[in-house]
């Protein structure tokens, strides 16, 4: 379902990744050098920035993100 | 700098009303939600709800629905919380404190209120 | 309701002591974790946010870590101004919900 609206409630922040907040809404996301193999599947839907540098991604599927705007 | 001034001590008697002021400083005011805490003498910290300035809008903790009431007046800049049909178990710390992606920055000095008869 | 556990609930260290306190959460909180430091008469201030972002002008020794439903927050070199009370706070459902708290001692 989705999020109630609060400013009390933290957004989505894939497991191990660095996250910051950008703004009332979104969410700025590092998830840099983690040795990942695949991308983080909890992404939230208010996600404005994503780093996936320095990782093990060799290929994306067709709409890896469905889940961001 | 940030700063959310509240109200002074106040003292009061069981089935009376406290309004607690939380006037806000060095922010725009409508941009940041803002939130309501109490602490019980030696107790811990309870999320009593929040407001979002720029159209009132609000969330209670279940616990704190009804005799709690949340409110704004923007052109002050300030945050209300009014409680009524006080009981002693409502003797705590009140706190404001500011909000925006889930997290609360700059707190209040908080406000004592004291009900006894 | 998210419940939150912290331990201990207090603590004596010594200044130059590294210092570890838990909060466990009752259910999968995601990362959505902060960290607050409390002090008689001052201000609540915020420490960490999202488990492990540190706030603006928070020293380097505190750091947060932690996932699923247990997190701890770290204090490397404990300095004279450190004792104080510390809560951990949940923001993955509403209520937002707070730790017992610990509250640091000087040995």
């Known amino acids: 379902g989705s999020s109630p609206r609060s400013g009390v409630l933290l957004r989505g922040c894939p497991t191990h990744c660095h996250c910051e907040p950008d703004g009332r809404m979104l969410l700025r996301v590092d998830c840099s050098d983690l040795g990942l193999s695949e991308l983080p599947s909890n992404l939230s839907v208010f996600t404005s920035y994503l780093d996936l540098s320095m990782n093990n991604i060799s290929q994306l599927l067709p709409n890896p993100l469905p889940s961001l705007r | 700098q940030v700063q959310l001034v509240q109200s002074g001590s106040e003292l009061k008697k069981p089935g009376a009303s406290v309004k607690v002021s939380c006037k806000a400083s060095?922010?725009?005011?409508?941009?940041?939600?803002m939130q309501w805490v109490r602490q019980a003498p030696g107790q811990g910290l309870e999320w009593i709800g929040e407001?979002?300035?720029?159209?009132?809008?609000?969330n209670y903790n279940q616990g704190f629905t009804g005799r709690f009431v949340l409110s704004v007046d923007t052109s002050v800049s300030t945050a209300y919380l009014q409680i009524s049909s006080l009981k002693a178990e409502d003797t705590a710390v009140y706190y404001c404190?500011?909000?925006?992606?889930?997290?609360?920055?700059?707190w209040g000095q908080g406000t004592t209120v004291t009900v006894s008869s | 309701d998210i419940q939150m556990t912290q331990s201990p609930s207090s603590l004596s260290a010594s200044v130059g002591d590294r210092v570890t306190i838990t909060c466990r959460a009752s259910?999968?909180?995601?990362?959505?974790l902060n960290w607050y430091q409390q002090k008689p008469g001052k201000a609540v201030k915020l420490l960490i946010s999202?488990?492990?972002r540190l706030h603006s002008g928070v020293p380097s020794r505190f750091s947060g870590s932690g996932s699923g439903t247990d997190y701890t927050l770290t204090i490397s070199s404990l300095q004279p101004e450190d004792f104080a009370t510390y809560f951990c706070q949940q923001g993955n459902s509403l209520p937002p919900t707070f730790g017992g708290g610990t509250k640091l001692e000087i040995k």
């Open positions: 999202y488990r492990s």
């Open positions: 060095g922010y725009t005011f409508t941009n940041y939600w």
């Open positions: 407001i979002d300035p720029s159209d009132s809008y609000t």
């Open positions: 404190a500011r909000s925006l992606s889930g997290y609360v920055d700059y």
């Open positions: 259910q999968d909180i995601s990362n959505r």
